[in-house]
């Protein structure tokens, strides 16, 4: 669910996850267009995993699971079903894939209309 | 009907090895996580391991790391414990279990004695 | 590890009385994302626990609505209502916050 991204962000991240509430073309709410760096790129390959997750019948936005925070790493579990494995999976790989960028302030509150309209494929 | 059966369980003697099975029915198996969990002789419950929806990730208690290994066989829907190194304090009845779901299976006995 | 402690062994009950049964954890249950991960279970004599209680207060389908749980992040309550002779058993409360998940010792529920 939205809390548990926003709290595996915070733990492995140095930055706030509102930093990436609209950044870029992908994090955020939708998402189309090129990635324009590698923050860009952590949050597509994000909505690609929910996008796997929503087809194997989970809800990526509402679903809650239990994850614990232990010295700046995301450790999925105790997990109840798969959905809660692969969404926990999700928000760790971008929580880590996050932690490892540098911040671009030109790409905060970008404009959308400059976002192509095709994306890259995913994985 | 979720269904959950154990078996496998007998007298071992110290240092001996077991493999427990389960074969589980009535839900869709790969959609979930699994475990065992033991209840002791003096009737306290203790979770021995679980094992991850597709296999790929295990985990235990510090008292069996190293001894016990949980698997699985998604296509034959049953569940292992692969046991050795067996000591008197694993004498329990062992439970295959989704515990925070339920139900739990009836359970099979391991007796570790020489 | 997480302790999970049940003060009392046993609890005596008078048919058709309430009764309310304690644990306690050493960490906080409450997740960031507001669950509580403590769930309540029962041992009838000769047969294999059953979930009664999930999240702290959530009723398991087909419990009977006279089971009732409540409680803060570390101090939990299972409430019975109007205890009938099927009730008695062994109620054990557990964790799952984190690994490993952890149960207390039980509390033996018995008729007066």
């Known amino acids: 669910g939205i809390l548990e991204l926003a709290g595996t962000v915070g733990c492995v991240g140095p930055r706030t996850p509102i930093a990436y509430m609209k950044y870029g073309c992908f994090c955020g709410l939708g998402g189309h267009g090129q990635p324009r760096d590698a923050i860009d790129w952590c949050c597509h390959g994000h909505d690609c995993c929910y996008t796997r997750a929503e087809e194997a019948g989970c809800s990526p936005k509402t679903e809650r699971y239990s994850w614990q925070c232990v010295n700046q790493s995301v450790l999925c579990g105790p997990a109840e079903n798969k959905c809660q494995e692969l969404l926990c999976k999700c928000d760790q790989e971008i929580a880590n894939c996050l932690a490892q960028t540098e911040y671009n302030l030109k790409y905060l509150f970008y404009p959308q209309f400059l976002c192509e309209p095709d994306s890259p494929k995913c994985d | 009907e979720v269904k959950l059966v154990e078996s496998g369980g007998g007298l071992v003697k110290p240092g001996g090895s077991l493999k427990l099975s389960c074969a589980a029915s009535?839900?869709?198996?790969?959609?979930?996580?699994m475990s065992w969990v033991r209840q002791t002789p003096a009737k306290r419950l203790e979770w021995v391991a679980t094992?991850?929806?597709?296999?790929?990730?295990?985990y235990y208690p510090d008292s069996v790391k190293g001894r016990f290994t949980i698997s699985r066989d998604n296509a034959r829907n049953t569940l292992y414990l692969q046991m050795s190194c067996l000591r008197s304090e694993d004498t329990a009845l062992y439970y295959c279990?989704?515990?925070?779901?339920?139900?739990w299976g009836q359970g099979t006995t391991l007796t570790v004695s020489s | 590890d997480i302790v999970m402690t049940q003060a009392a062994p046993s609890v005596p009950v008078t048919p058709g009385d309430s009764v309310s049964i304690s644990c306690r954890s050493s960490?906080?249950?409450?997740?960031?994302?507001?669950?509580?991960?403590l769930y309540w279970f029962l041992q009838r004599p000769g047969q294999s626990p059953q979930r009664l209680i999930y999240?702290?207060?959530n009723l398991a389908s087909g419990v009977p609505d006279r089971f009732s749980g409540r409680g803060s992040g570390t101090d939990f309550t299972l409430r019975i209502s109007r205890v009938e002779a099927e009730d008695v058993g062994v109620y054990y409360c557990?964790?799952?916050?984190?690994?490993?998940?952890?149960f207390g010792a039980g509390t033996k529920l018995e008729l007066k």
């Open positions: 009535g839900f869709t198996f790969s959609n979930y996580p």
């Open positions: 999240y702290m207060s």
């Open positions: 557990m964790q799952s916050l984190e690994y490993p998940l952890t």
């Open positions: 094992i991850s929806s597709g296999g790929d990730d295990t």
């Open positions: 960490k906080s249950l409450l997740h960031s994302n507001g669950i509580t991960y």
């Open positions: 279990a989704r515990p925070q779901l339920g139900p």
